[in-house]
């Protein structure tokens, strides 16, 4: 791994579990620079593997609301606008970090958690199982 | 919003900035259950809008390594295996939370940061700009 020289101005940690437990400032710094949010926000409808977005809410998690993609069809939309079952619509998933309140219901104590979320769908050639 | 009853066993926060600064346990709980990792890991190659994965490393960020998708083509792969420019390969982007060391180089002090990452690509019908 990469060794980071320690900044002498770092806060001290009196926590016995240091460095397992760290301080996190929840004032989010937003580094997003989506150059055209309007255009990219309609991909879910214009895709050959379109998807719907479902709201998943969990007050014990931060962020409490996550939007999940569910593919609309099992197949993909062809040039005629029909579902073609020779291709498969599949979810593109990403592992993300969230904060889970631990102990439960605590406003200022969390544990990092990895979850797998579906971000959108893509059209793939199927694995061949059935040979004529 | 949802009001969460406070657990009496919560750790106290002596921090003046509470609740802006919280304690986070970095022992990650992995809730991932990819039910078909063997089959789903090759979508980037089997998609009609295939992508390459590029490694982005930043020691001041947690996680320090993030993989970013870049679409291989401007168009989409058709049934003949050729690139069809009547369709567009576009990146599916997601806003994710990461931890940024703050002050820099500190091992136990972070700030939440939102970044936009490209997770994969999907094939979309283009927006018509040119009418014959």
């Amino acid at each position: 791994g990469i060794t980071i020289p320690r900044n002498p101005g770092c806060p001290n940690s009196e926590d016995k579990n240091f460095p397992r437990t760290v301080m996190v400032n929840l004032n989010i710094h937003n580094r997003n620079t989506n150059t055209n949010p309007k255009r990219s926000s309609d991909y879910y409808n214009r895709s050959t593997s379109p998807w719907n977005l479902h709201r998943n809410e969990d007050p014990e998690r931060y962020p409490s609301v996550i939007w999940e993609a569910k593919c609309r069809h099992l197949g993909c939309i062809n040039a005629d606008g029909n579902v073609d079952y020779h291709m498969n619509s599949v979810p593109i998933q990403q592992e993300i970090l969230v904060l889970r309140r631990e102990p439960p219901h605590c406003p200022n104590s969390f544990r990092l958690e990895k979850i797998l979320v579906s971000v959108g769908c893509t059209c793939v050639t199927p694995i061949v199982h059935h040979v004529a | 919003g949802i009001t969460i009853p406070r657990n009496p066993g919560c750790p106290n926060s002596e921090d003046k900035n509470f609740p802006r600064t919280v304690m986070v346990n970095l022992n990650i709980h992995n809730r991932n259950t990819n039910t078909n990792p063997k089959r789903s890991s090759d979508y980037y190659n089997r998609s009609t809008s295939p992508w390459n994965l590029h490694r982005n490393e930043d020691p001041e960020r947690y996680p320090s390594v993030i993989w970013e998708a870049k679409c291989r083509h401007l168009g989409c792969i058709n049934a003949d295996g050729n690139v069809d420019y009547h369709m567009n390969s576009v990146p599916i982007q997601q806003e994710i939370l990461v931890l940024r060391r703050e002050p820099p180089h500190c091992p136990n002090s972070f700030r939440l940061e939102k970044i936009l990452v490209s997770v994969g690509c999907t094939c979309v019908t283009p927006i018509v700009h040119h009418v014959a």
Partner: nanobody, 125 residues
Framework: QVQLVESGGGLVQPGGSLRLSCAAS????????IGWFRQAPGKEREGVSC????????YYADSVKGRFTISRDNAKNTVYLQMNSLKPEDTAVYYC??????????????????WGQGTQVTVSS
Amino acid sequence: QVQLVESGGGLVQPGGSLRLSCAASGFTLDDDAIGWFRQAPGKEREGVSCISSSDGSTYYADSVKGRFTISRDNAKNTVYLQMNSLKPEDTAVYYCNTCQIYGLGHDAAAPLGSWGQGTQVTVSS
């Protein structure tokens, strides 16, 4: 050759039961999630159930929960779908396929392979 073969369909009265089988040849099901999908006349193909190999997690469509049970026998390289309390709306061609369960609540399934002939299930009095 790599193949998944569905069998066990037939004509059954409402309230009756059937057990569908999906047998794999040419590859082992040990590390694959396998599921059942169906297509009713004039309707889109839809996911019915899927069973993971890794952690045994399962997916069931809301319309079949409590009535259908998916199971696997890796020794026989076969996946089964036990269908009880059948209704006329269960009439469809049933297909098996490798699948992926997804969603934070394991509430969706996607097919990953090509489709076979399927097996016809007709529920009628």
